[in-house]
């Protein structure tokens, strides 16, 4: 039975040209994590294999950095990076767990404007 849950950073926003950390955390299970896949819609961005470490997809190698931890850092953000991101935890004996993050990349002035009205 799959007892684990994935906690994510949820819905996040960032400035165009900036960077953002995507983070997921698997809890409430003793399952062994064998690999974490990071996907954007249907594109594979990177994987972290428990035995062999990080591998970044060739088409993203200039804009994606591994970590921190099992997270992923996206750099030089563009408006086209807006969308859904998924962390897929491959585990045994449980199987796969999937977490979802929605990233909105804003024009710099919009992001700054929005920041003034954030509630602490």
């Amino acid at each position: 039975m799959m007892t684990g849950t994935i906690e994510t950073t949820g819905n996040i926003s960032a400035e165009k040209g900036g960077s953002i950390i995507l983070q997921c955390h698997l809890s409430s299970t003793t399952a062994q994590v064998t690999q974490v896949n990071w996907e954007q819609q249907d594109q594979l961005l990177a994987i972290c294999n428990a035995d062999l470490g990080w591998h970044i997809s060739p088409s993203f190698k200039d804009r994606v950095a591994p970590g921190p931890g099992l997270g992923l850092t996206l750099q030089s953000l563009t408006v086209n990076d807006t969308g859904e991101y998924f962390c897929i935890y491959h585990t045994y004996p449980d199987g796969t767990y999937t977490g979802r993050i929605f990233l909105e990349v804003l024009e710099s002035s919009v992001a700054e404007h929005g920041a003034r009205f954030q509630i602490p």
Partner: antibody, heavy 121, light 107 residues
């Protein structure tokens, strides 16, 4: 098309070392891992270990730890497996294979033709 | 380490028969299991990965099922070209252990 071409037959004396090569073509070598599997005469398949051609990280079967070294040369898209202190029970056909780990399922989708290593005094 | 046990070790069946090979893991591995076919004197070839996903180009008479500890490879209608030894393999993380193999012959 994807191809893995291995070096030729080797005959070695007990205590010697052997280095088998596996030249890849038809895909981006550094985007995958290479695994090595051996098969003694009339026996089943034995996993020896694997290496990432992306970052060089390795993981070896426990029974071969200390005797085996796997390396890659991305400039020539070639993987190597060196086995030291050879014994008669190391006589086997040695296969390299490409590992598709992007899916998370670590299966071996393309195989080399095999290299027979005979250890005999 | 997780052990993989196949049964039977060999079998003989007639052309057109339905053939079933089983593989048992000593601990649960979800669906991280692959099946390989090795014809006499040839290189192994992947048939199925993720327990039930047919590799491209593999005939549809081959199918895989199971999850956790118990897995099955089925040949729905045995053909002469299916004479081979079949191996299961755990594919979650190292060691990527193979089962002992099942030799399939034609009666």
């Amino acid at each position: 098309q994807v191809q893995l071409v291995q070096s030729g037959t080797e005959v070695k004396k007990p205590g010697a070392s052997v280095k088998v090569s596996c030249k890849a073509s038809g895909y981006t070598f550094s985007s995958y891992a290479i695994t090595w599997v051996r098969q003694a005469p009339g026996q089943g398949l034995e996993w020896m270990g694997w290496i990432s051609a992306y970052n060089g990280n390795t993981n070896y079967a426990q029974k071969l730890q200390g005797r085996v070294t796997m390396t890659t040369d991305t400039s020539t898209s070639t993987a190597y497996m060196e086995l030291r202190s050879l014994r008669s029970d190391d006589t086997a056909v040695y296969y390299c294979a490409r590992v598709d780990f992007w899916s998370g399922y670590n299966y071996f989708d393309y195989w080399g033709q095999g290299t027979l290593v005979t250890v005999s005094s | 380490d997780i052990q993989m046990t196949q049964s039977p070790s060999s079998l003989s069946a007639s052309v057109g028969d339905r053939v079933t090979i089983t593989c048992r893991a000593s601990q649960g591995i979800s669906n991280y299991l692959a099946w390989y076919q090795q014809k006499p004197g040839k290189v192994p070839k992947v048939l199925i990965y993720a327990a039930s996903t047919l590799q491209s180009g593999v005939p549809s008479r081959f199918s895989g099922s199971g999850s956790g500890t118990d897995f099955t490879l089925t040949i729905s209608s045995l053909q002469p070209e299916d004479v081979a030894t079949y191996y299961c393999q755990k594919s979650n993380s190292a060691p990527l252990t193979f089962g002992g193999g099942t030799k399939v012959e034609i009666k």
